[in-house]
Interface confidence: medium
């Protein structure tokens, strides 16, 4: 999916993986983005290598709820924030108007079944305009050195682990074939690099109730949630994880 | 339902400005995301952007920015897209079109037809 | 942007004849963010299909959706004279908005 890379800076796509064995997978952020006072920016999760089912999506800001994307349910916007986010695009959530107090921790809050809660953080800082702009300017500069310094620190990696195999080979000269007819077997069976998001399988998730692991609230609480607040659904999440 | 009403065709010249307007009625307007949308003659559908009339919040495809400007009057839940400094390339029919907290334009205004002609 | 292609851009069918017209994405979205409207000349388009295979209200049950990732069909069991019109795929899943380019579809 491109959308999950929609506003990514140069650290690149952020990954929550989580502790737990059984729970296989992962929260792709935006990470940690910046934005001009007054503008807005989208924010977007992602949920990857699982084919649990997504039951729903909340957006936190510290702890404070901001919107809930429901599977049977659709959205709701919490109304102290309804004229300044936006729903979407996809299961993203639009900030807009924003200001210096918006600067914080973001959170998005898979819940499925059977994984149980995935959680992933956006860092978002709002920078007043020129502060913005200033920051543009040595971005690039940084970017360009950081680049160079890359390069440089490759190229020695790859002239040592040459020369290191260089010396390998005279000694294990008499095994080459042993080895190559083991190394032949195990391109065989080798998991692939992972594929870069919008090729990987999409698994479409089914509903399967409003109970995820909600935070110190139970089941009987939640749906006093949706039944107090005034619930809006024209039309359903996009519910889906992508298995890669 | 919301039902969206569209102003009347509008000839303009080159470099003037346009405001056209899309009237809401049967729904809680304020809470519906009215869509503008750009179809040139014999050709497909192109998104401008949106306006929340609750707060007035805009979001635009990057390639209108400074090209339109969308405004709400609650008092009378209507939405206006001002176009600026107009050229043929903005001769088309501008569609407004609504969406709640779904996914899809399920309300669709009938449609307002630019033309700009010295 | 995400860039949707549509095949064929122009086709005539026979009263009776199964029509598929399809939609390609560029970059894999989830179905629910796949939408199609039709558009008769003169008139502005309707809600057809959204995510992926819901008909909207009061379309015929002669129409289908389907498809997943990048690849999105839009399809007419049996093909009538009132279903001659302009067909739209639209994606919501990232911003810009995105349509396809439309498919024309006559009858024979």
């Known amino acids: 999916m491109r959308w999950c890379l929609l506003l990514i800076w140069a650290q690149g796509l952020r990954q929550a993986p989580l502790a737990s064995g059984m729970m296989t997978g992962t929260i792709e952020t935006t990470g940690n983005i910046s934005a001009e006072k007054g503008g807005s920016i989208i924010l977007q999760c992602h949920l990857s290598s699982t084919t649990a089912q997504v039951t729903q999506v909340n957006w936190e800001q510290q702890d404070q709820l901001l919107a809930i994307c429901n599977a049977d349910l659709g959205w709701h916007i919490s109304p102290s924030f309804k004229d300044r986010v936006a729903p979407g695009p996809g299961l993203g959530l639009t900030l807009q108007s924003l200001t210096v107090n918006d600067t914080g921790e973001y959170f998005c809050i898979y819940h499925t079944y059977p994984d149980g809660t995935y959680t992933g953080r956006i860092f978002l800082e709002v920078l007043e305009s020129s502060v913005a702009e200033h920051g543009a300017r040595f971005q690039i500069p940084l970017l360009g050195a950081m680049a160079a310094t890359l390069v440089v620190i490759c190229t020695a990696v790859i002239v040592v682990v040459a020369l290191t195999r260089k010396k390998k080979a005279l000694r294990i000269h008499s095994v080459e074939g042993d080895l190559r007819r083991k190394s032949a077997g195990q391109e065989e069976w080798s998991p692939s690099a992972p594929s870069p998001p919008g090729s990987c399988v999409q698994a479409e998730a089914a509903p399967a109730g409003l109970c995820g692991e909600q935070r110190g609230e139970d089941c009987a609480e939640l749906h006093d949630y949706f039944n107090v607040l005034s619930y809006r659904s024209l039309g359903n999440c996009s519910f889906f994880t992508e298995t890669g | 339902q919301v039902q969206l009403q569209q102003s009347g065709p509008e000839l303009v010249k080159p470099g003037a400005s346009v405001k056209i307007s899309c009237k809401a009625s049967?729904?809680?307007?304020?809470?519906?995301?009215i869509n503008w949308v750009k179809q040139r003659p014999g050709q497909g559908l192109e998104w401008i952007g949106w306006?929340?009339?609750?707060?007035?919040?805009?979001y635009f495809n990057e390639k209108f920015k400074g090209k339109a400007t969308l405004t709400v009057d609650k008092s009378s839940s209507t939405v206006y897209m001002l176009l600026s400094s107009l050229t043929s390339e903005d001769s088309a029919v501008y569609f407004c079109?609504?969406?709640?907290?779904?996914?899809?334009?399920?309300?669709w205004g009938q449609g307002t037809t630019l033309t700009v002609s010295s | 942007e995400i860039v949707l292609t549509q095949s064929p851009a122009l086709m005539a069918a026979s009263p009776g004849e199964k029509v598929t017209i399809t939609c390609s994405v560029s970059s894999s979205i989830s179905s629910s963010n796949l939408h199609w409207y039709q558009q008769k000349s003169e008139t502005s388009p309707k809600p057809w299909i959204y995510g992926t295979s819901n008909l909207a209200s009061g379309v015929p049950i002669r129409f289908s959706g389907s498809g997943s990732g990048t690849s999105y069909s839009l399809t007419i069991s049996s093909m009538e004279a009132e279903d001659a019109a302009t067909y739209y795929c639209?994606?919501?899943?990232?911003?810009?908005?995105?349509f396809g380019g439309g498919t024309k579809l006559e009858i024979k």
């Open positions: 079109a609504g969406y709640g907290l779904g996914h899809y334009f399920d309300n």
């Open positions: 639209q994606q919501w899943s990232s911003y810009p908005l995105t």
């Open positions: 049967g729904h809680t307007f304020t809470d519906y995301y």
């Open positions: 306006i929340f009339p609750g707060s007035g919040n805009t």
